[in-house]
Amino acid sequence: EVEKTACPSGKKAREIDESLIFYKKWELEACVDAALLATQMDRVNAIPFTYEQLDVLKHKLDELYPQGYPESVIQHLGYLFLKMSPEDIRKWNVTSLETLKALLEVNKGHEMSPQVATLIDRFVKGRGQLDKDTLDTLTAFYPGYLCSLSPEELSSVPPSSIWAVRPQDLDTCDPRQLDVLYPKARLAFQNMNGSEYFVKIQSFLGGAPTEDLKALSQQNVSMDLATFMKLRTDAVLPLTVAEVQKLLGPHVEGLKAEERHRPVRDWILRQRQDDLDTLGLGLQGGIPNGYLVLDLSMQEALS
């Protein structure tokens, strides 16, 4: 806390400019009017104030706006945003996407801080849902943003917003998140033709059920192994050897390299060995010829 002292004669700030970087902390406190600072916030970002000097400027704004800063000030905080605590940000009402962009720009190139996470949370809650423009903005700054949300939060993403999602935005999503996103993507891309549809839906397929994978296998999509390895194990297990062969197309040869890894390993255990042999890849571990396969889950359902 800076001591309250009178401003030395001739030092009262008439505008926010570079000359203020020569002021000591107590002089900034005494000689800069908080209302002037608030109206000229856009200038602060261009002035190389030290970390300690910015503390004083923040303190002045806190005194002027104890209930939280107005958006006109928030939009122009610039580097002063880095001084804000999550508690400060929870007092704000940020409604403009331009304000959000301006503050994300300040933190650009750095990991998402608690301040940024709180800001985004406040903004999204204020809007009621993650609309396309917001999602566009957030994933541009933080490609992993979508995967940082819980399945519950993802449920508020409208299908129209899915168009903003790039494959790299889903890199760190887990199956529970893809389970929520996949149906939205399917809805969003439903009017596209076969090959275009597959290009768009591919990154979401970690949430696809068996019946959709069966349908894709009829469309000559040539799924790559990296995508196949991200599919839900429970969705892959019921696929026949012929369906997997059609699904992967020329990439089917890659199964050999992945035979010890899920979901390939578990899928092999469910196939007849003679069916696997038709692939000519030397895959081992299938059900030996002559063995009877009982689907106990079906039996339980019937009894």
């Epitope: 570079e18 261009a46 002035i47 190389p48 104030f49 030290t50 970390y51 580097y79 880095l82």
Partner: nanobody, 116 residues
Framework: QVQLVESGGGLVQPGGSLRLSCAAS????????VAWYRQAPGKEREAVAV???????KYADSVKGRFTISRYNAKNIAYLQMNSLKPEDTAVYYC??????????WGQGTQVTVSS
């Protein structure tokens, strides 16, 4: 992460001159104000000169008429020409931009000692 490297310091007699240089690893100087600061032992860091992106210059009262700040955007270098040096100018000198100063990220500085 942007790296700032200050150089040109040394031991000089009162009344002597030194020219400090500040080189940046990225193109952060263009479009940004650049300032020189100094920190004497036991004292807080203080700004001594600033040059805006438009080339306007401002100086602390204690160095006016003796120090000159300049910049060469094409090479990402800023300079501080120091003339008529006094013992009280003894300090570690740093350069920085608004972003670096705001996040308290500094170069290693360059030591200036004015002594007979």
């Amino acid at each position: 992460q942007v790296q700032l490297v200050e150089s040109g310091g040394g031991l000089v007699q009162p009344g002597g001159s030194l020219r400090l240089s500040c080189a940046a690893s990225g193109s952060i100087f263009s479009g940004n104000a650049v300032a020189w600061y100094r920190q004497a032992p036991g004292k807080e860091r203080e700004a001594v000169a600033v040059i805006t992106r438009d080339g306007d210059t401002k100086y602390a009262d204690s160095v006016k008429g003796r120090f000159t700040i300049s910049r060469y955007n094409a090479k990402n270098i800023a300079y501080l020409q120091m003339n008529s040096l006094k013992p009280e100018d003894t300090a570690v000198y740093y350069c920085n931009t608004a972003r670096g100063a705001a996040v308290d990220s500094w170069g290693q500085g360059t030591q200036v000692t004015v002594s007979s």
